[in-house]
Structure formats: C-alpha cells, structure tokens
C-alpha cells in the first residue's frame, strides 16, 4: 500500500517492533483543572455503604500506587447507624489503563495493561431469588 | 542511590527526551479474566443513589468512549421508593489515564493524560452547617 512520507517532527518508527510499539510521553497533561471543590475524599466514611481504601502498590506498574475500595459491610447503614442486611453494599468497579514495565526492571519500556479496580461502594436493593 | 544494572535486552534510552518518553507495547494484557460474575452493570438502577450513564466520546483519545455517571437525584431513594432529601446522592470520582496522539499528526507518538471521571454514585449523610 501507499506509505505517506512521515512528518520530520515525529519520533522515529523504524523500531523492529513497530507498529506494536509506540512512544508515550509521560509528562502527564491533567485535564482536571476545573474539578468540583466538593472532593469525594470523605465519602468513604459518610456513605450508607462505607468502604475502606487499600493501597495496592507495584513498583513495576505506572501508576505504582492504586487505591482499592473494599466495602466494610455486607449490608448498608440505616438511619440509626446500624447495619441493615435487607440492603447490600456493593463495589463500583471500573476498568483502567496502566503501564507495566516490560521486560521487568527496564526503565523505559512498558506494556499497556487493563485492570479492574473498585473505586467505592454503593447501597443496592438485593436481588431476591424465590424458590418455588 | 543504588543504580540497578540495566537489563541488556532493554530498549535504548539515549533519547534526549528520556525519561519523559517511553516505549509502550500495545499488545494489551487484560488482567480482568477472573472478575466477579456479579457484574456491576445493573447497580446504577438498583442503587439507593441511582445514576444515569452518559457516553463521553472522543475519536482522538484512547479509549475513545468513557462512560460518565450522573446522579439522578439530589437525595437518596428510601424504603418506600421516594427521594429522601435528608440524604445526598454524590458521584464517586476517579482519575484515569488515557492516551492522546501528540503531536497530533504523528503516527506512533502519544501522551498520557489524566482525566477525572464519575464512576457511579453513593448515598451519604449530608454535612450540616449550624449557624450560631
């Protein structure tokens, strides 16, 4: 097929692994400048489905620290401050992209990886299975 | 500090931009094979702080589609199915990494970007400010 001449300002792609390998600039651009001042940092304690945050650390991954939510109770906290087992605390999960150093210990070579993380918990009505 | 001897199989890091620019292999490894079969896909409807999912689309970003949660109510759903305004539905937010082509005309160079996304909603006790 036709190969369009490459713009001279682009990184060299003559690597033997190209096109499976791309160059990624780690100077992260943060689009979160106008984030809501009502930070979600204390929601884990104030929620009716409270959670604890566990530090998942891996020096071979970027970012190396990911916080994982674990729901504190099976049930949800009611108006009296007690656990109501007629409701369920469940984790809200999201798939995120991370970079994993590959081969291990190499300073500037990574692989894209998708991981599922629990971000927080929410209180849901349980699905009740009726036995005939 | 200690310098770990460089793995001889590592890509060359003599690039003038190193260590800001790294090589990334696109053969995405998906660590989510043993995810819980209790998928969170219906929690948005069953939650006491239900939310709608909005498709945030950008063809020049990877991943191109990100789902954003918007809480349906200011309050939370009580046992009678009504909105209780003594409680608050709030979004649980998480910072995620995405890739954006940069410079935009280059075929194999990208930049990491952090964006804040709302993953779901949780029901919290409001912070009440008492006026003296």
């Amino acid at each position: 097929g036709i190969t369009i001449p490459r713009n001279p300002g682009c990184p060299n792609s003559e690597d033997k692994n190209f096109p499976r390998t791309v160059m990624v600039n780690l100077n992260i651009h943060n689009r979160n400048t106008n984030t809501n001042p009502k930070r979600s940092s204390d929601y884990y304690n104030r929620s009716t489905s409270p959670w604890n945050l566990h530090r998942n650390e891996d020096p071979e991954r970027y970012p190396s620290v990911i916080w994982e939510a674990k729901c504190r109770h099976l049930g949800c906290i009611n108006a009296d401050g007690n656990v109501d087992y007629h409701m369920n605390s469940v984790p809200i999960q999201q798939e995120i992209l991370v970079l994993r150093r590959e081969p291990p210990h190499c300073p500037n070579s990574f692989r894209l990886e998708k991981i599922l993380v629990s971000v927080g918990c929410t209180c849901v009505t349980p699905i009740v299975h009726h036995v005939a | 500090g200690i310098t770990i001897p460089r793995n001889p199989g590592c890509p060359n890091s003599e690039d003038k931009n190193f260590p800001r620019t790294v090589m990334v292999n696109l053969n995405i490894h998906n660590r989510n094979t043993n995810t819980n079969p209790k998928r969170s896909s219906d929690y948005y409807n069953r939650s006491t702080s239900p939310w709608n999912l909005h498709r945030n689309e950008d063809p020049e970003r990877y991943p191109s589609v990100i789902w954003e949660a918007k809480c349906r109510h200011l309050g939370c759903i009580n046992a009678d199915g009504n909105v209780d305004y003594h409680m608050n539905s709030v979004p649980i937010q998480q910072e995620i990494l995405v890739l954006r082509r940069e410079p935009p005309h280059c075929p194999n160079s990208f930049r990491l970007e952090k964006i804040l996304v709302s993953v779901g909603c949780t029901c919290v006790t409001p912070i009440v400010h008492h006026v003296a």
Epitope: G1, T3, I4, R6, N7, C10, S13, P19, R20, V22 | L26, N27, I28, E57, P59, E60, R61, Y62, P63, S64, V65, L99, R100, R101, P104, H105, C106, P107, N108, F110
Partner: nanobody, 123 residues
Framework: EVQLVESGGGLVQPGESLRLSCKAS????????LGWFRQAPGKEREGISC????????YYTDSVKGRFTISRDNSKNTVYLQMNSLKTEDTAIYYC????????????????WGQGTQVTVSS
C-alpha cells in the same frame, strides 16, 4: 508484506448502493483505528469516516452521515464501508487507512494506506 487492499468499487446509478471492503495483510488491525478517505478529480483528499480501535465507535463527515456506515471485523482483519443512496458527488477514488489506537483528522497520523478503489456514480 504489510498492505491494505480495497475492493468493491464500481459504476452505479444515483440512489444505488455499494459496499467497499478493505483487507489488511501482514499486520493485525486490533490496535488500529480505520479510516475511509476519498479524492474526487481536481479536489483535495477528504476524510469521510473512521472507526475506533477500542470500542468500534463510528464517526462520519456531515456529507455522508445517515447514508454511509463503517464497520469492522477484526477476525477477518477487514473494515467495510456500506454506501447507500449514492449521489453523483460521491464519485471519487476511495482509500482506506490505518492509524494506531485513535482516529485522527491528520492524514500523517495514518500509518498504512491502500491503493484505492474507484467509485463512479452516474446516470
């Protein structure tokens, strides 16, 4: 050898349909966004549609929205362009191109290009 090969072009009357195919060989389309471009005689090349790598989301230029549909089949390493309600102004050489990860409005961002297939719409 790495290549993209288009097929399915031809001569049709206004209002008729055509389905273009673009088959990749020598590389996998898994991590590529696939774009369709066209160039009419004496005109600039224009991007008309693109389908993303991550979730197969489709994008179209205004002139073909509602008439053209882009789709992909990674198992066949092929991208398609279904063209309905064709107009005389759709006459052009149609090219498919592959860009890593994301669509782009810049031609230079596309790594691979096909040789093109002629579409002529005439009564």
């Amino acid at each position: 050898e790495v290549q993209l090969v288009e097929s399915g072009g031809g001569l049709v009357q206004p209002g008729e349909s055509l389905r273009l195919s673009c088959k990749a060989s020598g590389f996998s389309l898994d991590y590529y966004a696939l774009g369709w471009f066209r160039q009419a005689p004496g005109k600039e090349r224009e991007g008309i549609s693109c389908i993303t790598s991550s979730d197969a989301s489709a994008y179209y230029t205004d002139s073909v929205k509602g008439r053209f549909t882009i789709s992909r089949d990674n198992s066949k390493n092929t991208v398609y362009l279904q063209m309905n309600s064709l107009k005389t102004e759709d006459t052009a050489i149609y090219y498919c191109a592959a860009a890593l990860l994301t669509c782009s409005s810049y031609y230079d961002a596309y790594t691979y290009w096909g040789q093109g297939t002629q579409v002529t719409v005439s009564s």
